[in-house]
């Protein structure tokens, strides 16, 4: 037989076995010009020493073969002995290692069999009523097709599905959408209405995420507040990655799960912007404020469930950093300025009350004064920190107040509001004899002692009413008792106590008169 012709003899090898896992697959035959035809196929398994034979049976009942050698593509003309106007059956037999493997057959009319392409280019994926909708441009000059899809998950084999007939410039397919696992889809096409025409190759994989993005399972830790008033939020546990089908591993556009970090700064509510969304990979620095943090997972079908944490405020205080002066016009705070053109947010709330009751004030951008200090003033009429109670004050700073992640904590401290010097005056001063020349003075703790770091010291004053001599005794803020010694019997004394803050001298308590009685010996 001539190589260009189909040989009408028995093939030169024994009968075939189509049951093995390897062998020829996916035979496609079609007309490529007015008088030429091509068949191509795939071979699965080791290719060394394999000879392929394209078999053909005609409507007349006669059968022939083309010897293709090691090639998996063969062209022939309409003069090769194969009738192209009538139905024929074609298949491939591959002879290797003393056995023959056989492909599935195709039965078709070669003249009317056109080479169809799979969907090419961009396949758009969307969700429609709980199903997956795929849409693509029909390949040029190929309107009118039957379309099939196959799909698999990471744990299941390929399943075949039908898209139905297509007859437009764009083609589409409705496919099943999995709730919780990613899928790989491939599509193929063949000529519509041409009995037995060959299927195209399978398209490139279309990777589809589950309808529900996986819930993020992550953990955070927050570092200590640094010298710059910022602390780093770090991810302790990465979100679990979605398991992907074989063809989607590596680069799988479409299945990506995006994890976003949503920050909500709870402190300083008077600032312009309270929330910011970031990519999870870019972990931010935070001020010492309280935050709510949410991790939101989303894929091409939208957001999924989120996971939320509360990051409490950093309560480390620096009692010396803030200077407060109270004048007739009002109160002014001074603190070391951060930099040029900084906006400050001053937040205060009564101690022991819910964080929701915080009040704040935003300064206009300000430069440091000649002493390198930043200031904030308010009048008595404003009512700010006007009540005689303990307030917790935090000052935040930012050169870009509209950017949530650029705030830093300048300081946190306590302040006693209202007329602190009067309100802090110790009450219930009492004097008890201690010895022949000494007394013990006790008093109730000043209201200032409820405010950590505010009470600097107590001062106890003793006045000799005879000589008008005065002595003053400083007492630690944690103590509410002192022993006065070196006193003389029979002399009248008055004692007073005051409570001082770092910036304010207290008001003396009411004078308390006492004397040590003269001891008369029997």
């Amino acid at each position: 037989c001539r190589t260009s012709e189909c040989c009408f003899q028995d093939p030169p090898y024994p009968d075939a076995d189509s049951g093995s896992a390897s062998g020829p697959r996916d035979l496609r035959c079609y007309r490529i010009s007015s008088d030429r035809y091509e068949c191509s196929w795939q071979y699965e398994g080791p290719t060394a020493g394999v000879s392929h034979f394209l078999r053909c049976c005609l409507s007349s009942g006669r059968c022939c073969y083309f010897a293709a050698g090691s090639a998996t593509r063969l062209q022939f003309s309409d003069q090769a002995g194969v009738s192209v106007l009538y139905t024929v059956t074609l298949w491939v037999e591959s002879w290797a290692r003393n056995q023959t493997e056989k492909s599935p057959e195709v039965t078709l009319q070669l003249y009317n069999s056109v080479k169809y392409e799979p969907p090419l280019g961009d396949i758009k994926v969307s969700k429609l009523a709980g199903q997956l909708r795929m849409e693509w441009e029909t390949p040029d000059n190929q309107v009118g097709a039957e379309v099939q899809f196959r799909h698999r998950t990471p744990s299941s084999p390929w399943k075949l599905g039908d898209c139905g007939p297509q007859d437009d410039d764009t083609e589409s397919c409705l496919c099943p959408l999995e709730m919780n696992v990613a899928q790989e889809f491939q599509l193929r096409r063949r000529q519509l209405g041409s009995q037995g025409s060959s299927w195209s190759k399978w398209s490139s994989p279309v990777c589809v995420p589950p309808e529900n993005p996986p819930q993020p399972q992550v953990r955070f830790s927050v570092e200590q507040l640094g010298q710059d008033g910022r602390r780093r939020l770090t991810l302790k546990e990465q979100p679990t990655q979605l398991e992907l089908p074989e063809g989607c591993q590596g680069l799988a556009p479409g299945t990506e799960v995006t994890y976003r970090l949503q920050l909500h700064m709870l402190s300083c509510p008077c600032k312009a912007k309270a929330t910011r969304t970031l990519h999870l990979g870019k972990m931010p620095y935070l001020s010492g404020a309280a935050y709510n943090v949410a991790v939101i997972s989303s894929n091409q079908f939208g957001p999924g469930l989120n996971q939320t944490w509360h990051i409490p405020a950093d309560t480390h205080t620096e009692p010396v950093a803030l200077n407060i002066s109270v004048g007739t016009n009002g109160t002014t705070m001074y603190w070391p300025a951060r930099a040029q053109s900084m906006t400050y947010c001053i937040e205060w709330q009564p101690v022991g009350q819910d964080g929701g009751l915080a009040t704040c004030s935003l300064t206009a951008p300000q430069d440091p004064d000649p002493a390198g200090m930043a200031t904030y003033s308010w009048s008595r009429e404003s009512g700010a920190m006007g009540q005689e109670k303990c307030y917790y004050i935090t000052i935040f700073a930012s050169a870009h107040p509209e950017k949530l992640t650029l705030w830093s904590t300048v300081l946190s401290t306590y302040h006693f509001g209202g007329n602190a010097s009067a309100a802090g005056t110790p009450h219930h001063v009492s004097v008890k004899n201690h010895s022949l020349d000494s007394v013990s003075v006790d008093w109730a703790p000043s209201l200032l002692s409820t405010c950590p770091g505010v009470l600097k010291e107590y001062v106890v004053r003793c006045r000799d009413e005879d000589s008008k001599q005065v002595s003053e005794h400083p007492v630690q803020p944690t103590e509410t008792q002192v022993t006065l010694s070196g006193l003389r019997a029979g002399v009248a004394y008055t004692v007073q106590v005051r409570a001082d803050t770092a910036w304010l001298r207290g008001v003396w308590s009411q004078p308390q008169r006492f004397s040590i009685e003269v001891q008369v010996s029997d």
Epitope: L58, G61, K102
Partner: nanobody, 123 residues
Framework: QVQLVESGGGLVQAGGSLRLSCAAS????????VAWFRQTPGKEREFVAS????????NYADSVKGRFTISRDNAKNTVFLQMNSLKPADTAVYYC????????????????WGQGTQVTVEP
């Protein structure tokens, strides 16, 4: 060598159904096309239906189209012919035949043949 054994024939009323089976001895049977033929006394053997080794291609004589269905189970080395809406004219001995080629029409020479099974349809 492939040996074929038919079964499932019998007597049935017109309009009834029968299912014929063709079992093969050889493991290589899953790479063979199989056809059913029938013959009545004094007449030539007549093609009924054929199926390819993959099961992807089937072919029927015009007289049985829509009534008969050919199928195969390669795991069991068996081919079936489901015959519904039987008519007295379907009475014949039914033969199963196998070949390494699949013929796209009623014509074709088959290498291996069974002994046949009798189907009788009463009016």
């Amino acid at each position: 060598q492939v040996q074929l054994v038919e079964s499932g024939g019998g007597l049935v009323q017109a309009g009834g159904s029968l299912r014929l089976s063709c079992a093969a001895s050889a493991r290589i049977f899953n790479s063979y096309a199989v056809a059913w033929f029938r013959q009545t006394p004094g007449k030539e053997r007549e093609f009924v239906a054929s199926i390819s080794w993959s099961g992807g291609s089937t072919n029927y004589a015009d007289s049985v189209k829509g009534r008969f269905t050919i199928s195969r189970d390669n795991a069991k080395n068996t081919v079936f012919l489901q015959m519904n809406s039987l008519k007295p004219a379907d009475t014949a001995v039914y033969y199963c035949a196998a070949d390494r080629n699949y013929y796209p029409s009623v014509l074709g020479k088959y290498t291996y043949w069974g002994q046949g099974t009798q189907v009788t349809v009463e009016p």
